[in-house]
Interface confidence: low
């Protein structure tokens, strides 16, 4: 299935040689990505990533992914996509719309996870997972 | 006390079909991450078969029992399953099940909790 | 599937001797060193010893102990006791992207 609508090809990883990300930070394309080993539910992991001076990753393009799903290893994490019910649409916490594939819908599953499978997962809000949080380099 | 108790084991005859239970007692099932099967052949390994995730039902299995063996829950008898169809000889061995409290957590990769097992023999 | 491999298959020490078992995974394990390491006794299930790779699980004695990283990973038992008489294994973990867990064959540990 498709993931998102429209590939922007053309993007490359680009690799730190400075101190642009935090200790333990992943950098990639001017930003800087943190992979929890805890877990909590997703209003948690919200805080958790606000706390740390950065919102819930928003993967908005399939380059993005693909990063992300490189150093996930085969875990669940949180990112920063919800599910407004009365819109019947997905939303970044940017509150842009996500019009891509997100796999395992099921009307308790409001939020979404990567890092298990391939594709954007829907997941309980409710459950505890990892997160990974998302900040500008400096 | 927390425990697993597996039943549903016994003699099939080959290309028959089985169906193991595992119920949990003691801890909270539906806050364990994952509930496994892992079989041992009469004085051979361990060997991995598959996981279930208790909290959304993802399951996942090793590449040999992909299409025949089907990890399933009902939460509400705090009890996982193995669906074994298609059996052969090799299949026979002692099955185990496992939890992994957090493959996700700080607690990390560990099945801290087993089952004593059930005996399954495929045979003619 | 990720293929674990250990090594001896089985030794025979002395009581109070320090064992060492060895673990070598096909491919590297995750980045958090997800390795377990389990002791079986005849007709009792596994039971969990040490897991991502040197934290040593509840009730276990210090004797025990894990290291290593990536493919490579040990158990030491620092003075073999009796009641440590047992097949040992090791596993590692991948993941769903990579067929999850895989066991090692065992070392089967015994008193001199």
């Known amino acids: 299935p498709q993931i998102f609508n429209k590939s922007n090809d053309g993007f490359t990883t680009t690799r730190s040689y400075g101190t642009v990300c935090p200790k333990d930070w992943e950098f990639y394309q001017a930003r800087c990505f943190f992979l929890s080993t805890s877990e909590s539910s997703w209003n948690e992991s919200r805080d958790f990533c606000k706390g740390k001076g950065s919102t819930l990753a928003i993967v908005n393009t399939p380059e993005k992914l693909k990063f992300l799903q490189d150093i996930t290893d085969a875990e669940k994490y949180f990112i920063g996509l919800i599910y407004h019910r009365e819109e019947k649409r997905w939303r970044w916490i940017n509150n842009s719309v996500f019009n891509g594939n997100v796999t395992n819908q099921n009307q308790n599953f409001n939020c979404a996870t990567i890092g298990l499978t391939k594709t954007f997962d829907a997941a309980s809000c409710d459950i505890s997972y990892r997160r990974i949080c998302e900040k500008n380099a400096k | 006390e927390q425990q697993l108790v597996e039943s549903g084991g016994g003699l099939v005859k080959p290309g028959g079909s089985l169906r193991l239970s595992c119920a949990a007692s003691?801890?909270?099932?539906?806050?364990?991450?994952?509930m496994c099967w892992v079989r041992q052949a009469p004085g051979k390994c361990l060997e991995w078969i598959g996981c279930?995730?208790?909290?959304?039902?993802?399951?996942y299995y090793a590449s040999w029992a992909k299409g025949r063996f089907t990890i399933s829950k009902d939460s509400a008898k705090n009890s996982v399953y193995l669906q074994m169809n298609s059996l052969r000889a090799e299949d026979t061995a002692v099955y185990f099940c496992?939890?992994?409290?957090?493959?996700?957590?700080?607690?990390?990769?560990?099945?801290?909790?087993w089952g004593p097992g059930t005996l399954v023999t495929v045979s003619s | 599937d990720i293929q674990m491999t250990q090594s001896p298959s089985s030794l025979s020490a002395s009581v109070g001797d320090r064992v060492t078992i060895t673990c070598q995974a096909s491919?590297?394990?995750?980045?958090?060193?997800?390795l377990a390491w389990f002791q079986q006794k005849p007709g009792k299930p596994p039971k969990l010893l040490i897991y991502?790779?040197?934290t040593l699980a509840s009730g276990v004695p210090s004797r025990f102990s894990g290291s290593g990283s990536g493919t490579d990973f040990t158990l030491t038992i620092s003075s073999l006791q009796p009641e440590d008489v047992a097949t040992y294994y090791c596993a590692g973990y991948r993941g769903a992207h990579t067929d999850g867990d895989a066991f090692g064959c065992g070392t089967k540990v015994e008193i001199k």
């Open positions: 496992a939890r992994a409290p957090s493959y996700s957590g700080d607690g990390g990769h560990g099945y801290d909790l």
């Open positions: 991502t790779t040197s």
């Open positions: 491919e590297s394990v995750d980045r958090n060193n997800r």
């Open positions: 279930l995730s208790v909290g959304d039902g993802h399951t």
């Open positions: 003691g801890f909270s099932f539906s806050r364990s991450s994952y």
